[in-house]
């Protein structure tokens, strides 16, 4: 293993756990993750007497590095005293030392949040002659804090008298400003605001961002929607370029494929935004099979004012697959809105996150503008989920009280779709709703023709049905009653239900 310097941590008790009459108290210092041995731990106890004991080093199993603890026991007037633990590791370098200064015990406190903000560029997108960094130390329990600025890890000589502290309620905030020359800022150094508080160190770092992309201009490349890919079978991908400054030069968007094969003809659209910037989109039709087989597509953006081309690429998502579960619900009637009702659809536990959601009524797909669907969110362990919301009118549910929420997803089988039906008034057609649970799966058939699963209207028979004690020719579970719908002029539909 290569030489590794230790990380040093103070070990203290909670103040509330130390008896007020305690005549001596022990604190410690942990040096961990170093290699090779040894480390030297010494203590500065000020004017107090103390006895120290350094435990033998132990080996950390995974890394093979070492850890050791040094303990200091002090007696007398230790309550307000600060102690310094000094750890030296000569194998790292002859002068490698880490000092930790802390008190005997730690009070319950809220630690600070440390955040560095930087001044803006000028109107033309250029750095001004000086750059200001502002270190915000916020939300901590009032107490002494020390702020240090580091440049590439080295302490800077900064006038900290300008640091100001304010208190809001029970928490305090402090800010410190660092002014840098443009030359220093552009030199690619890292600047760190380091805060010491209650024996702990908190920090945030910043540096000039790498010019991987020209300032201000962003490009995004979308994957085809599952609906376009699996249902319409005409997938497209879109390259979107935003925040372009309108100018005489032309923005060029060029498409290519990683395989080197030719691309289809793309369509292009330019839009001037309210803030004066230009948005350019280019949409490329892709082959369904090419996409499913993992072809990578690239969009290259060039413009005379861009210092370099922007490149974006997209391909089918890798990783495991899981089909969505779909649950549809109707909200109860709300006072004052008897003629409107909200339907909700929870689609969950699918992977990857690409999904299309549709609502259907009367076997017709409703326009996307009718419903609102969230972006996929992680469930932390079992896939992604979305919610979709549809508002329906009385006229619609009186015409036909069945709405379908359909999810299109690559892992859904057999046809990449999963759907659930929902009614605004489930089961009210045949009288009062009963409390038994409707069967999980309700099958219907006409004559010998097996039909699709059909909702049994909750647990209540259709008004044109009569219930009997099961029929010998019905292939379903014997424990369920059978209901025969006596539809005029048609072969009777037979379905199981709880009558």
């Amino acid at each position: 293993a290569s030489t590794q310097s230790p990380s040093v941590f103070p070990l203290t008790r909670c103040c509330k756990n130390i008896p007020s009459n305690a005549t001596s108290v022990t604190l410690g210092c942990l040096a961990t993750g170093y290699f090779p041995e040894p480390v030297m731990v010494t203590w500065d106890t000020g004017s107090l007497n103390g006895t120290t004991m350094t435990l033998p080093a132990t080996t950390l199993t995974l890394s093979g590095h070492y850890a050791t603890i040094s303990l200091l026991t002090v007696s007398g007037a230790w309550a307000k005293q600060m102690f310094t633990c000094r750890v030296a590791h000569t194998p790292s370098s002859t002068d490698w030392v880490d000092n930790k200064t802390f008190s005997v015990c730690s009070r319950d406190f809220t630690p600070p949040t440390v955040k560095i903000l930087q001044s803006s560029c000028d109107g033309g997108g250029h750095f001004p002659p000086t750059i200001q960094l502002l270190c915000l130390v916020s939300g901590y329990t009032p107490g002494t804090i020390n702020i240090t600025w580091l440049e590439d890890g080295q302490v800077m000589d900064v006038d900290l008298s300008t640091a100001s502290t304010t208190q809001e309620g029970e928490l305090a905030s402090t800010q410190s400003e660092l002014t840098l020359s443009q030359k220093h800022w552009l030199s690619d150094r890292t600047y760190t605001c380091q805060v010491t508080y209650q024996g702990h160190t908190f920090e945030d770092s910043t540096k000039k961002c790498a010019d991987s992309n020209p300032r201000g201009v962003s490009a995004y490349l979308s994957r085809p929607s599952p609906f376009d890919l699996f249902i319409r079978k005409s997938p497209t991908i879109t390259c979107l370029v935003v925040d372009l400054a309108p100018s005489k030069g032309t923005v060029n968007l060029t498409w290519s494929r990683a395989s080197g094969k030719p691309v289809n003809h793309s369509t292009r659209k330019e839009e001037k935004q309210r803030n004066g910037t230009l948005t350019v989109t280019s949409t490329l039709p892709v082959g369904t099979r090419d996409w499913i087989e993992g072809e990578t597509y690239q969009c290259r953006v060039t413009h005379p004012h861009l210092p370099r081309a922007l490149m974006r690429s997209t391909t089918k998502t890798s990783g495991p697959r899981a089909a969505p579960e779909v649950y549809a619900f109707a909200t109860p009637e709300w006072p004052g809105s008897r003629d409107k009702r909200t339907l909700a659809c929870l689609i969950q536990n699918f992977m990857p996150e690409d999904i299309s959601v549709q609502w259907l009524h009367n076997e017709v797909q409703l326009p996307d503008a009718r419903h609102s669907t969230t972006q996929p969110r992680k469930t932390k362990g079992s896939g992604f989920f979305v919610f979709s919301r549809l508002e329906v009118t009385r006229a619609e549910w009186e015409q036909k009280d069945e709405f379908i929420c359909r999810a299109v997803h690559e892992a859904a089988s057999p046809s990449q779709t999963v759907q659930r039906a929902v009614s605004v008034n489930p089961g009210l057609a045949g009288g009062s709703a009963q409390s038994q649970r409707a069967p999980d799966r309700v099958l219907c058939h006409s004559g010998q023709q097996q039909g699709l699963p059909r909702a049994a209207g909750g647990s209540v028979p259709h008004p044109r049905c009569h219930c009997g004690a099961g029929r010998a020719d019905w292939p379903g579970p014997p424990e369920l009653d059978v209901c025969v719908e006596e539809a005029e002029g048609e072969a009777p539909w037979t379905w199981t239900g709880l009558c």
Epitope: L60, L62, S63, G319, E353, K378, T379, K380, G381, G383
Partner: nanobody, 122 residues
Framework: EVQLLESGGGLVQPGGSLRLSCAAS????????MAWVRQAPGKRPEWVSS????????HYADSVKGRFTISRDNAKNTLYLQMNSLRPEDTAVYWC???????????????YGQGTLVTVSS
């Protein structure tokens, strides 16, 4: 651009061992927690194991505890999964994965490799 490439899969007899590797590129490997995920044929995906940036903290699914060991070599930008005492139920595609936010336990990860097939059969 984050790229992960698994290798080391193959056919092995029950009780045997395999070592999977995952070569990472396009990001600062040492700054990211890493994980292994698997999916058996016809089953839902299953998180297998995770390791923190420094390699000191590791977590395992109950089904592999004591048999699988996750490790990493930040100098080589490589993640490993040592699989011992393999069982037929370990047959699956194995992916190495990472995430911008959280990779120290079950998750839907932001980035996956292409996967490597492990078949445990006599």
């Amino acid at each position: 651009e984050v790229q992960l490439l698994e290798s080391g899969g193959g056919l092995v007899q029950p009780g045997g061992s395999l070592r999977l590797s995952c070569a990472a590129s396009g990001f600062t490997f040492g700054n990211y927690d890493m994980a292994w995920v698997r999916q058996a044929p016809g089953k839902r995906p299953e998180w297998v194991s995770s390791i923190d940036t420094g390699g000191d903290i590791t977590h395992y699914a109950d089904s592999v505890k004591g048999r699988f060991t996750i490790s990493r070599d930040n100098a080589k930008n490589t993640l490993y999964l040592q699989m011992n005492s393999l069982r037929p139920e370990d047959t699956a595609v194995y992916w190495c994965a990472t995430d911008e936010e959280y990779a120290l336990g079950p998750n839907e990860f932001d980035y996956y490799g292409q996967g490597t097939l492990v078949t445990v059969s006599s």
